[in-house]
């Protein structure tokens, strides 16, 4: 039983307009259109949104008016298919318009581009931004929604409304401040970093639903909500899981108005039933809608009930295990996952799911055996290596991180992953390895009890980025295998990869290692990316290079950049010293 209204409405568009209000309706339609047609100019999208909004108002006035009974996908799809340059701009995506709903919508969804060919967003001067904000606040905020949505086509739409609200608040406050830049820039940096993290987390949810289905998503949700709400009954957790699955299915399916509406209903339900869910929700539930939903999604785990009995009684020692399992497999496994997760906030969600899978596999085998109880009696012993593997990995990598610091830890991962999957494009390897390396600063500071859920669940998000980027242009069977075989075993699969011995080293190209004076004006982050790009290319040329060899070359490279950036004639320095560096590096690596 879900919390959502099931009553039919004569006009779906009128229903959603009334539920959400004009401001949210327009914002969500803009997000939807920008996520579908990622290359279209801002002005074209605004025009389409205004047309849809005017139409929605006619339906609010009279639900029986012409076309008001059409589904939202029909209305929105018809509108998108009026875009004149569809074939020239989007190629085969234009073929979607020949299909009928709901195939047309799913066709659009399948053409969403995780890595669209769009220019990097360059932040203008603070005064320029403040002037634009004051001149036309509405257009300024719409532009923000548009630019984020087109670059992040799976961004969780109701959460993007929350980001836009914070974006507006930052400008409202800081454009009046004495030192606008000091006030605004840290806030914008925080929004950018949080936004990227939010986008990546949602991308994993959508990938889970797309590639592994509803059951996989529900299992993830049972584990996570049971950790977060350990005092809640199984029936309550199950209900929340059903409703949360509906919300994310809608957003991932492009049903953004329904998704935002249902997310608001779910937040309302949670706050009305706090007493049976969690003691940590009080502050969240006092906030306005967008803040409330965000707060609930991020709320800390409640304390575990004091006297939880041993799990073994119901799931190993009981003579009814196979009977209970046979009667309702998914429910019984769901109860196992709930009971295990609420007792283990110290485990990652993916580990809990591996344990549940092991338990399921054991029951499938043992319940068909001559003596089932004897067969599954030691099932919990099988969990030990599964628990120890991520524990040991996190311990080793946190030690390495503490020894090296973030930048050099990222470099170690760059080398490690380039050797595992050298066919993957250099920009993807740099982006993914940099993000993998951020696990150190993010998680290693935590005490033991919080390290694993922080680290391994974060790594699942980052490896999903690799998977979706690789799916667009598949180049490595090993990546495809790790990405598609099992959602919960992606990280162990990548961890287990050794150096790819079949890889034929890339031909040496001096141009790849030619640098210019423009590197001197880059930010520290951009300069790091340049150096890390060179490091990946080095490994692709010489996959058998030792750590020591690579370190020597990278140290020489850093010194070269530092020297030439201090030189009077920088460009000449880069040209002359660069040639020497390339020759020395070739000699050092035996290229």
């Amino acid at each position: 039983r879900g919390v959502f209204r099931r009553d039919a409405h004569k006009s779906e568009v009128a229903h959603r307009f009334k539920d959400l209000g004009e401001e949210n309706f327009k914002a969500l339609v803009l997000i939807a259109f920008a996520q579908y047609l990622q290359q279209c100019p801002f002005e074209d999208h605004v025009k389409l949104v205004n047309e849809v909004t005017e139409f929605a108002k006619t339906c609010v006035a009279d639900e029986s008016a012409e076309n008001c009974d059409k589904s939202l996908h029909t209305l929105f799809g018809d509108k998108l298919c009026t875009v004149a340059t569809l074939r020239e701009t989007y190629g085969e995506m234009a073929d979607c318009c020949a299909k009928q709903e709901p195939e047309r919508n799913e066709c659009f969804l399948q053409h969403k581009d995780d890595n669209p060919n769009l220019p990097r967003l360059v932040r203008p001067e603070v005064d320029v931004m403040c002037t634009a904000f004051h001149d036309n606040e509405e257009t300024f905020l719409k532009k923000y929604l548009y630019e984020i949505a087109r670059r992040h086509p799976y961004f969780y739409a109701p959460e993007l409304l929350f980001f836009a609200k914070r974006y507006k608040a930052a400008f409202t406050e800081c454009c009046q401040a004495a030192d606008k830049a000091a006030c605004l820039l840290p806030k914008l940096d925080e929004l950018r970093d949080e936004g990227k993290a939010s986008s990546a987390k949602q991308r994993l949810k959508c990938a889970s639903l797309q590639k592994f289905g509803e059951r996989a998503f529900k299992a993830w949700a049972v584990a996570r909500l049971s950790q977060r709400f350990p005092k809640a009954e199984f029936a309550e957790v199950s209900k929340l899981v059903t409703d949360l699955t509906k919300v994310h299915t809608e957003c991932c399916h492009g049903d953004l108005l329904e998704c935002a509406d249902d997310r608001a209903d779910l937040a309302k339900y949670i706050c009305e039933n706090q007493d049976s869910i969690s003691s940590k929700l009080k502050e969240c539930c006092e906030k306005p809608l967008l803040e409330k939903s965000h707060c609930i999604a991020e709320v800390e785990n409640d304390e575990m009930p004091a006297d939880l009995p041993s799990l073994a009684a119901d799931f190993v020692e009981s003579k009814d295990v196979c009977k209970n399992y046979a009667e309702a497999k998914d429910v019984f496994l769901g109860m196992f996952l709930y009971e295990y997760a609420r007792r283990h906030p110290d485990y990652s969600v993916v580990l809990l799911l591996r344990l549940a899978k092991t338990y399921e596999t054991t029951l499938e085998k043992c319940c068909a055996a001559a003596d089932p109880h004897e067969c599954y009696a030691k099932v919990f012993d099988e969990f030990k290596p599964l628990v120890e593997e991520p524990q040991n990995l996190i311990k080793q990598n946190c030690e390495l991180f503490e020894q090296l610091g973030e930048y050099k830890f990222q470099n170690a991962l760059l080398v490690r992953y380039t050797k595992k999957v050298p066919q993957v494009s250099t920009p993807t390897l740099v982006e993914v390895s940099r993000n993998l390396g951020k696990v150190g600063s993010k998680c290693c500071k935590h005490p033991e009890a919080k390290r694993m859920p922080c680290a391994e669940d974060y790594l699942s998000v980052v490896l999903n980025q690799l998977c979706v980027l690789h799916e667009k242009t598949p180049v490595s069977d090993r990546v495809t295998k790790c990405c598609t075989e099992s959602l919960v075993n992606r990280r162990p699969c990548f961890s287990a990869l050794e150096v790819d011995e079949t890889y034929v080293p890339k031909e040496f190209n001096a141009e790849t290692f030619t640098f210019h004076a423009d590197i001197c004006t880059l930010s520290e982050k951009e300069r790091q990316i340049k150096k890390q790009t060179a490091l990946v290319e080095l490994v692709k040329h010489k996959p058998k290079a030792t750590k020591e060899q690579l370190k020597a070359v990278m140290d020489d490279f850093a010194a070269f950049v530092e020297k030439c950036c201090k030189a009077d004639d920088k460009e000449t320095c880069f040209a002359e010293e660069g040639k020497k560096l390339v020759a020395a590096s070739q000699a050092a690596l035996g290229l």
Epitope: Q210, F212, G213, E214, R215, K329
Partner: nanobody
């Protein structure tokens, strides 16, 4: 492994009705989504309708909405498609399909792992 066997196809006049059945054997559990697709000669296979085994939620192609009804009988492990007000353009081979994971895109044939052999529906006067 899941086996799907369709029945109920045949020749019918425009405006007439037919009821297709699809018997599923093997391990169909509550996570399944079952669907009907059709393929007319020389055309691509197209989505007709789908139903979630777990909650009974239904999905229809616009071209059949209001004329076709999908349903299932859990006790018999059988899927049905009641087709009313049939038209000449409904002529096709109708396939029953199962997606054991209920993946997000329910109109995409590649997301269905198991297929029946098909049953021919001809609408002609």
């Amino acid at each position: 492994e899941v086996q799907l066997v369709e029945s109920g196809g045949g020749l019918v006049q425009p405006g007439g009705s037919l009821r297709l059945s699809c018997a599923a054997s093997g391990s169909t559990d509550s996570a399944y989504r079952m669907g009907w697709f059709r393929q007319a000669p020389g055309k691509e296979r197209e989505f007709v309708s789908a139903i979630n085994w777990s909650d009974g939620r239904t999905y229809y192609a616009d071209s059949v909405k209001g004329r076709f009804t999908i349903s299932r009988d859990n006790s018999k492990n059988t899927l049905y498609l009641q087709m009313n007000s049939l038209r000449a353009e409904d002529t096709a081979v109708y396939y029953c399909a199962a997606d054991p994971d209920s993946r997000l895109y329910y109109t995409v044939p590649q997301n269905y792992d198991y297929w029946g052999q098909g049953t021919l529906v001809t609408v002609s006067s």
